[in-house]
Amino acid sequence: KVILDKYYFLCGQPLHFIPRKQLCDGELDCPLGEDEEHCVKSFPEGPAVAVRLSKDRSTLQVLDSATGNWFSACFDNFTEALAETACRQMGYSSKPTFRAVEIGPDQDLDVVEITENSQELRMRNSSGPCLSGSLVSLHCLACGKSLKTPRVVGVEEASVDSWPWQVSIQYDKQHVCGGSILDPHWVLTAAHCFRKHTDVFNWKVRAGSDKLGSFPSLAVAKIIIIEFNPMYPKDNDIALMKLQFPLTFSGTVRPICLPFFDEELTPATPLWIIGWGFTKQNGGKMSDILLQASVQVIDSTRCNADDAYQGEVTEKMMCAGIPEGGVDTCQGDSGGPLMYQSDQWHVVGIVSWGYGCGGPSTPGVYTKVSAYLNWIYNVWKAEL
């Protein structure tokens, strides 16, 4: 049976086997087409999600679709039901928490009272002044907290207590990529991880350990990528994996937070990378132990210079490394998180591409997660 499962796929009505390599090849080889059903699917960017959270204390902002203007949500008459609606609009199904935070001196958006209409937040028509003088600070999911804070050094062995959202994404029991837990159902990774194998069946996720082989595998229900843009072939290197069964969170299995829409990190901002990838550029094999390293944001202009990536780093990507080189992600780290710590840990980047590993002028290039929030929310909403 193991051999059959490895090399063949069983079609129903009538029952017969087809070679597994015919799965997800764009041809209907089973009479009912089930060989093309459980495949990596692409999902369009979709319409603008009309709510967002700002890095200013996770305050809620609402879009007026008529004018295209954004407004900050006033705390007046804001309820748990409105908080749930806001989070559902972003595709969350968990119970949110919210609180009032004072309107700051730098508040640049108009503040309006919020109401609900057909399960979407709207601005109250006769919105007067914000009497409470407070904005809504909203958290849709408890995320980004770990049991242990990493020490700031070069490269060292990591503990799952520091990075409980890190997962190993495996095909046929072999580690292919890293990934990050975003909520009980969803794992974030890179689209290029699935270039070779587009059937969902053999992909598994392993969570809750810093050692590669030692933890149970979780079945995957769906793998969703964003539509490919042939004008920017390296853009859109992002994928969401939906797990068959929701994760139970614990000290070693927890979600990381998505970034805020306005999370603009300046050059030299400290960040962290982790992974089981190669420790040398062409260096033989994966690390059995999870490794961590501190890096920093590298200015896109520097990264696009003629002695570096020559304009290939787009606004949907970011560069990170250390100016003198030597610390970088490598093969096998793809899909893993580039992380920033404020109050919580945020996944600001996804390990995507680069020339070699650790070169001084060619740092790691990462998918900029904030550029894809709208897509993530639209995928989640479609799957609620």
Partner: antibody, heavy 117, light 107 residues
Framework: QVQLVQSGAEVKKPGASVKVSCKAS????????LHWVRQAPGQGLEWMGW????????GYAQNFQGRVTMTRDTSTSTVYMELSSLRSEDTAVYYC??????????WGQGTLVTVSS | DIQMTQSPSSLSASVGDRVTITCRAS??????LNWYQQKPGKAPKLLIY???TLQSGVPSRFSGSGSGTDFTLTISSLQPEDFATYYC?????????FGQGTRLEIK
Amino acid sequence: QVQLVQSGAEVKKPGASVKVSCKASGYSFSGYYLHWVRQAPGQGLEWMGWMNPDSGNTGYAQNFQGRVTMTRDTSTSTVYMELSSLRSEDTAVYYCARLHRGGHDYWGQGTLVTVSS
Amino acid sequence: DIQMTQSPSSLSASVGDRVTITCRASQSISRYLNWYQQKPGKAPKLLIYAASTLQSGVPSRFSGSGSGTDFTLTISSLQPEDFATYYCQQSYSTPVTFGQGTRLEIK
């Protein structure tokens, strides 16, 4: 220096097929996507699709789906664009163009395809 | 599909003039916009990519600006060799689409 050299002009009857070639030189053939764009006489530019010469993967604009096929021969660094079921509206100059940084930085000289009965 | 609308469709100017061509997208395309110049019987030539980055070898009198839906190509001081047709192109999503062109002729 980078060059894209296309095959010569063709005259075809309605319903026939045409295959235009584009030979690349002066750069790493597998390192850059190649796109096809056409221009009817006195008209604007119309994008037809793309090919990744490294993997052979292709993608076509909806208007041409089912009628266009892009292939490549890595041994000669040549990409081909075949358009079938030709009609008079397909009379145009067909260009191959190299993709770099989200723009088409090098273009072939163009191949005029005339469809006439 | 994203529609690209250029204005004006034709324009007469003199050598030394400052000329502006605009391009509007039917939806936001961030900065995913390119500008090309085409002379009769020749292939188009890339002038500007990513809305404002000058392609190598293109004279600095050409500049691009804009983001979202509205973009501009400016030629600061027209030279005789600049009389041609100019096209904008969005590279935000497929199908890639071009503006209908702006023909720049000598006054």
